[in-house]
Amino acid sequence: TGADTEAVVCVGTACYTAHSGKLSAAEAQNHCNQNGGNLATVKSKEEAQHVQRVLAQLLRREAALTARMSKFWIGLQREKGKCLDPSLPLKGFSWVGGGEDTPYSNWHKELRNSCISKRCVSLLLDLSQPLLPSRLPKWSEGPCGSPGSPGSNIEGFVCKFSFKGMCRPLALGGPGQVTYTTPFQTTSSSLEAVPFASAANVACGEGDKDETQSHYFLCKEKAPDVFDWGSSGPLCVSPKYGCNFNNGGCHQDCFEGGDGSFLCGCRPGFRLLDDLVTCASRNPCSSSPCRGGATCVLGPHGKNYTCRCPQGYQLDSSQLDCVDVDECQDSPCAQECVNTPGGFRCECWVGYEPGGPGEGACQDVDECALGRSPCAQGCTNTDGSFHCSCEEGYVLAGEDGTQCQDVDECVGPGGPLCDSLCFNTQGSFHCGCLPGWVLAPNGVSCT
């Protein structure tokens, strides 16, 4: 493929590989992709240090690179037609494997705006200077190259492969050689963490003449989030060396028997795990690492812990302390939401009360219901409110419009309703006549 020497660093749940070869960004991405990865992300200072470590490993193996200022592709690219955005840390570029924009960046210089062609990012290494953790490789953007024409000073690329988990390297208790074959087709005899689904071939002995045993193991998930080889006890043990070779392959203590045999042991506060080599803290929660209201939860076999928050709280960035969740951001209420410590409260607008289908729902208050009507006479319920009405001969009165006041028909706007005398009554009126006159059948005229 044109990609030669490689170096590998595995840490956390990812492995980084560095390759030398004058390839275009597309060819480099294709190379990473074929083995199940992508061109590397550099999403934090820590990740930049991992990438720097793998590049340093590669440079130690490479005799001489052609350019003093060498460039290595990473997975940061900007598609044609997508313009520069100076307000963002990634300036409008995005990681080839997807994922959100990240706050970390380490640009070499101010970027020029150009939307007419695809742009790709490489790490700029000054080979005249030693690679120091304090001086992380700068990001350089430029054309992405094409087959046979990778671009000036392009010397290689860095891939990243992510895994469910990692196994500890196998412990040898005597002379031998371990060869790890990773899922991304790299072989190595020195990995500080070995990715899930890797194979380990162990050849015991000091040379061909001595070689007596060989073992084959796979890094597998033995229980949820517990990754192990399934080997039991140190490998390649030899009475000739006892505990003197690599501490017998033991994680902490090695105890020799008189017959050249030995056993692994653990310091106070630790216990020996099923592999009979590794020691784990008896109870990582005993040091009370979780703060505030967080509870310490042990992982399987007491190997690790996480902090867990009570309902309504979530872990902060330290993963050790709890902060209140603002449940109101998810709009759980039909009308008003009030965030409270550890929870929230739904409230209803005036004229509504809690109820109806679904949590946090509000239903109209029937202000006109029997026994609660605020109106002196007629009451009509409306959505979220109500209105009062009055019987004939009365008009709405009062500041809140709930009272009914008698209409004085005798002084009505249409003038006198009676020909002679007018008597106002509650809600009505009647006419009368002067002495010697009689009220006519129409109840208005006097005859």
Partner: antibody, heavy 118, light 112 residues
Framework: QVQLVQSGAEVKKPGSSVKVSCKAS????????LNWVRQAPGQGLEWFGR????????DYNGKFKGRVTLTADKSTSTAYMELSSLRSEDTAVYFC???????????WGQGTTVTVSS | DIVMTQSPLSLPVTPGEPASISCRFS???????????LYWYLQKPGQSPQLLIY???NLASGVPDRFSGSGSGTDFTLKISRVEAEDVGVYYC?????????FGGGTKLEIK
């Protein structure tokens, strides 16, 4: 589709051994744990061991350690369970079961009845 | 070993009615990764067991949605919203958090 086909019923004398086979098909045999579960007549389910065919790694229920041996032949995608020093209480139906990526036992063999009787 | 107690031992149900089975564990099945490693299996008469629910609340492929699982770290419930005749059999809860994997004693669901 995933299938686990077990060998036929066995009748054994106390103190003898029995070897039950389980032929897998329809999935990558080497990459999944294969569990063995037994069920005594009218009783519940009891897990007694598992094997990872990829490298032959095994785990056993402490209750049976020393009497049970699990093996796998990758070339024929067949797993074997051998139980020695049989006693009458080993009379049960023995199931081979695939363990999936969610730690569930998702595919079960049809079961092999082993009867231990003098 | 993680020990579990399943109840009831027997559960007679009228078709169309809901049913509920409980399972209590001697220690929490909640892993530090936030997943609860609790499983439910059904063994129909004369058949091998079949997976119903994985990781406490996820329905296995092909299982009708009248089945549901819920619970906390140590107490779990399998619910059937409306029992059908085909649901008869023995229901087992199980844990796959720590070796040895263990099963509950079983609950026999029968039609009234």
């Amino acid at each position: 589709q995933v299938q686990l086909v077990q060998s036929g019923a066995e009748v054994k004398k106390p103190g003898s051994s029995v070897k039950v086979s389980c032929k897998a098909s329809g999935y990558a045999f080497s990459s999944y744990w294969l569990n063995w579960v037994r069920q005594a007549p009218g009783q519940g389910l009891e897990w007694f061991g598992r094997i990872y065919p990829g490298d032959g790694d095994t785990d056993y229920n402490g209750k049976f350690k020393g009497r049970v041996t699990l093996t796998a032949d990758k070339s024929t995608s067949t797993a074997y369970m051998e139980l020695s020093s049989l006693r009458s209480e080993d009379t049960a139906v023995y199931f081979c079961v695939r363990g999936d990526g969610y730690w569930a036992m998702d595919y079960w063999g049809q079961g092999t009845t082993v009867t231990v009787s003098s | 070993d993680i020990v579990m107690t399943q109840s009831p031992l027997s559960l007679p149900v009228t078709p169309g009615e809901p049913a509920s089975i409980s399972c209590r564990f001697s220690q929490s099945l909640l892993h530090s990764n936030g997943i609860t490693y609790l499983y439910w299996y059904l063994q129909k008469p004369g058949q091998s067991p079949q997976l119903l629910i994985y990781q406490m609340s996820n329905l296995a492929s092909g299982v009708p949605d009248r089945f549901s699982g819920s619970g906390s770290g140590t107490d779990f419930t399998l619910k059937i919203s409306r029992v059908e005749a085909e649901d008869v059999g023995v229901y087992y809860c199980a844990q796959n958090l720590e070796l040895p994997w263990t099963f509950g004693g079983g609950t026999k669901l029968e039609i009234k």
